[in-house]
Amino acid sequence: TPEVWVQVRMEATELSSFTIRCGFLGSGSISLVTVSWGGPNGAGGTTLAVLHPERGIRQWAPARQARWETQSSISLILEGSGASSPCANTTFCCKFASFPEGSWEACGSLPPSSDPGLSA
């Protein structure tokens, strides 16, 4: 069964800046990745970025840079300032859509005890 992993890290240099990394452990080819915060995309979450392997990347504030790391993993940097900036207990979710298997998603947040720069 495919699985999704999520890592959330606070940047040491900018304490309100986050990096989210997500990956898909499965055999199918990825068709779309959706990154959201505040919960899963279908359950009240707000979309931060949508990554398509052919048609490119769409992102919305406070997302600053979304990119593919490999064919099955992505990373997203969030801007730390402003009213819409994330806080330490924000939940981030990644949903990987693979054709024709379907979709798998997982969520993660910054571990309560983590220091800046420590990955989840």
Epitope: S29, L32, N41, G42, A43, R55, A97, F99, S103
Partner: antibody, heavy 120, light 107 residues
Framework: EVQLVESGGGLVQPGGSLRLSCAAS????????MSWVRQAPGKGLELVAA????????YYPDTVKGRFTISRDDAENSLYLQMNSLRAEDTAVYYC?????????????WGQGTLVTVSS | DIVMTQSPDSLAVSLGERATINCKAS??????VAWYQQKPGQPPKLLIY???HRFTGVPDRFSGSGSGTDFTLTISSLQAEDVAVYFC?????????FGQGTKLEIK
């Protein structure tokens, strides 16, 4: 304008074979996942075959697995369904459909369908 | 397999009145739910995707809602051209499945 035009349906005896074709136009065929969906007379919809845009991944339900084969020819903008060992319960209108990644794999375009009748 | 169960099987509504069709999934399907409209002798047409997003050209009297396992298609003010069979569909997990259909008629 997106167009999908099916052909190849007809009357065939039980145990026989048919090859359905779907001619696509009005979009970049190679960028889309495609499927065949059938509808028996007066009944609901059943997805019987799906193929990823790169052609590497296919899907068949147990009802047709081992008897049906989906394929595509991107140079010809065509989708095919090879149907062998046909049974009376395969009688249906067969639709070619296009999946949109950005719509959660919803089928945003359908052909008019081609009728397959399996009877002695 | 995820079973999509629609209710009711058939529905008669007066012109201008609200029509509501429900779809229940046997397990959570996230937001990967679509609704299709099929008129006699025609292929299905996409109405709603991602639970609540209207497809291009679909009148705003059609709306979708729900989450998890329970979803609803609403036609706020029934028009004569809305007479059709409506299907819900999940593309969350293979095998992708459809509801059995709801036949909508004018009372």
């Amino acid at each position: 304008e997106v167009q999908l035009v099916e052909s190849g349906g007809g009357l065939v005896q039980p145990g026989g074979s048919l090859r359905l074709s779907c001619a696509a136009s009005g979009f970049t065929f190679s960028s889309y996942h495609m499927s065949w969906v059938r509808q028996a007379p007066g009944k609901g919809l059943e997805l019987v075959a799906a193929i990823s845009r790169d052609g590497d991944s296919t899907y068949y339900p147990d009802t047709v697995k081992g008897r049906f084969t989906i394929s595509r020819d991107d140079a010809e903008n065509s989708l095919y369904l090879q149907m062998n060992s046909l049974r009376a319960e395969d009688t249906a209108v067969y639709y070619c459909s296009r999946h949109e990644d950005y719509f959660g794999f919803a089928m945003d375009s359908w052909g008019q369908g081609t009728l397959v009748t399996v009877s002695s | 397999d995820i079973v999509m169960t629609q209710s009711p099987d058939s529905l008669a509504v007066s012109l201008g009145e609200r029509a509501t069709i429900n779809c229940k999934a046997s397990q959570s399907v996230s937001n990967d739910v679509a609704w299709y409209q099929q008129k006699p002798g025609q292929p299905p047409k996409l109405l709603i995707y991602y639970v609540s997003h209207r497809f291009t050209g679909v009148p705003d009297r059609f709306s979708g809602s729900g989450s998890g396992t329970d979803f609803t298609l609403t036609i706020s003010s029934l028009q004569a051209e809305d007479v059709a069979v409506y299907f819900c569909h999940q593309a969350y997990r293979s095998p992708w499945t459809f509801g059995q259909g709801t036949k909508l008629e004018i009372k």
